[in-house]
């Protein structure tokens, strides 16, 4: 005969464990139902009654099957240098990541606690290592024969144009000036940009205004800068 299915709460067989999505209640000494994500235990089980679950209260969440008496509080609203990549819902915490042009100087379990602006390399210096979501730009002095005339977190040092006749020699922060109108270098004179760090988040160029006077998907429609390193500036 097939084993009889036990309905919670039930006393487990000696040496056995409770089933998936159940927990052992020490007080009742019974296997009892867990609450689903987005809920918490409002009333714990007894020998004769199962766990009573309730929805998480506003701005709180539970991500896992659980028997916690209170849901966890969502993190604070994202700051103006951040983008909310995951909203606070009953089943998940808010996640804030840094907006473009910033990197995460202090991370937390998910998302970022503190964003800082990417370092800008000043004229005479170019980007040696581009910024990422979690690391700052590294600047380096432009080597002889190269220059950067911009203050930028993406521009690298570019070679001087090669002149038939030099009017003004180039230096680390200025291109060479030729007397002839036809320099021999074939490179386009425009600045060379490194790509911004790849990011899955939405590419806002402005800080997102707070909170919610922008329409949210919400009711009823049917429808501290890093200290400047040598060759860098702050914002």
């Amino acid at each position: 005969l097939p084993a009889q299915v036990a309905f919670t709460p039930y006393a487990p067989e000696p040496g056995s464990t409770c089933r998936l999505r159940e927990y052992y209640d020490q007080t009742a000494q019974m296997c009892c139902s867990k609450c689903s994500p987005g809920q918490h235990a409002k009333v714990f089980c007894t020998k004769t009654s199962d766990t009573v679950c309730d929805s998480c209260e506003d701005s709180t969440y539970t991500q896992l099957w659980n028997w916690v008496p209170e849901c966890l509080s969502c993190g604070s609203r994202c700051s103006s240098d951040q983008v909310e990549t995951q909203a606070c819902t009953r089943e998940q915490n808010r996640i804030c990541t840094c907006r473009p042009g910033w990197y995460c100087a202090l991370s937390k379990q998910e998302g970022c606690r503190l964003c800082a602006p990417l370092r800008k390399c000043r004229p005479g210096f170019g980007v040696a290592r581009p910024g990422t979501e979690t690391s700052d730009v590294v600047c380096k002095p432009c080597a002889p024969g190269t220059f950067s005339n911009t203050t930028s977190s993406t521009d690298i040092c570019r070679p001087h144009q090669i002149c038939n006749v030099v009017a003004i020699p180039g230096n680390a922060s200025m291109d060479a000036v030729c007397t002839s109108t036809s320099p021999t270098r074939s490179m386009a004179p425009g600045a060379v940009h490194l790509p911004q760090p790849v990011s899955t988040r939405s590419q806002h160029t402005q800080p997102t205004p707070e909170p919610s006077t922008a329409p949210s998907t919400s009711f009823l429609l049917p429808m501290g800068p890093s200290p400047p390193a040598e060759g860098s500036t702050g914002d």
Epitope: S59, S73, C74, S212, T217, S218
Partner: antibody, heavy 120, light 108 residues
Framework: QVQLVQSGSELKKPGASVKVSCKAS????????MHWVRQAPGQGLEWMGR????????KHDPKFQDKAVLSSDTSVSTAYLQISSLKAEDTAVYYC?????????????WGQGTLVTVSS | DIQMTQSPSSLSASVGDRVTITCTAS???????LHWYQQKPGKAPKLLIY???NLPSGVPSRFSGSGSGTDYSLTISSLQPEDFATYYC?????????FGQGTKVEIK
């Protein structure tokens, strides 16, 4: 754009009931609460209760538990406040306001208010 | 219930003045759950500051908020003619959610 438009002023006799509506547009019913707040003439704001339109779950100030019934009809994007056994002291402007889930209860949009006058 | 007591109940000030309104809770309130509203006569309240110190889009930067625990404040750094109104603090920390009694800011 987000809008909450409430029904017009009401003049009621003591003992009667009134049902105030709040029609929402510009946003949908996911993760939002609709609150009702009343303001007696010359007085401050008093939170009465709120409804989660997605589930119909309500929460009241105990003071209004037997006085106010909150409901909503998502098919017409409208929340309702029904007040029963009206007394002169229920004369007030009644506001609906929304708070998005996760905004810690900040009521970011309000209806224009509905004046309910109770007089014999 | 958590009682919210605002101080002062009313004040008279001139354009350009710095004005501070305080709100004291009868028990501790998490700073995320403390908000301020502005109401002008005959109009609906408007969210002015949320979560103690954050300004919604469109609210001028002369408004600021601070505080923690039971003591919170709203400051207007340089009062403008359009700021004459009544201000309410609001706690959403524990139900029933409650408002302060209001502070009326009048022209001196």
């Amino acid at each position: 754009q987000v809008q909450l438009v409430q029904s017009g002023s009401e003049l009621k006799k003591p003992g009667a009931s009134v049902k105030v509506s709040c029609k929402a547009s510009g946003f949908n019913n996911k993760d939002i609460y609709m609150h009702w707040v009343r303001q007696a003439p010359g007085q401050g704001l008093e939170w009465m209760g709120r409804i989660d339109p997605a589930t119909g779950n309500t929460k009241h100030d105990p003071k209004f538990q037997d006085k106010a019934v909150l409901s909503s009809d998502t098919s017409v994007s409208t929340a309702y406040l029904q007040i029963s056994s009206l007394k002169a002291e229920d004369t007030a402007v009644y506001y609906c306001a929304r708070s998005p889930y996760g905004d810690f209860g900040a009521m970011d949009y309000w209806g224009q208010g509905t004046l309910v006058t109770v007089s014999s | 219930d958590i009682q919210m007591t605002q101080s002062p109940s009313s004040l008279s000030a001139s354009v350009g003045d710095r004005v501070t309104i305080t709100c004291t809770a009868s028990s501790s309130v998490s700073s995320n759950y403390l908000h301020w509203y502005q109401q002008k006569p005959g109009k609906a309240p408007k969210l002015l500051i949320y979560s103690t110190s954050n300004l919604p889009s469109g609210v001028p930067s002369r408004f600021s908020g601070s505080g923690s625990g039971t003591d919170y404040s709203l400051t207007i750094s340089s009062l403008q003619p359009e700021d004459f109104a009544t201000y309410y603090c609001h706690q959403y920390h524990r139900s029933p959610w409650t408002f302060g009694q209001g502070t009326k800011v009048e022209i001196k």
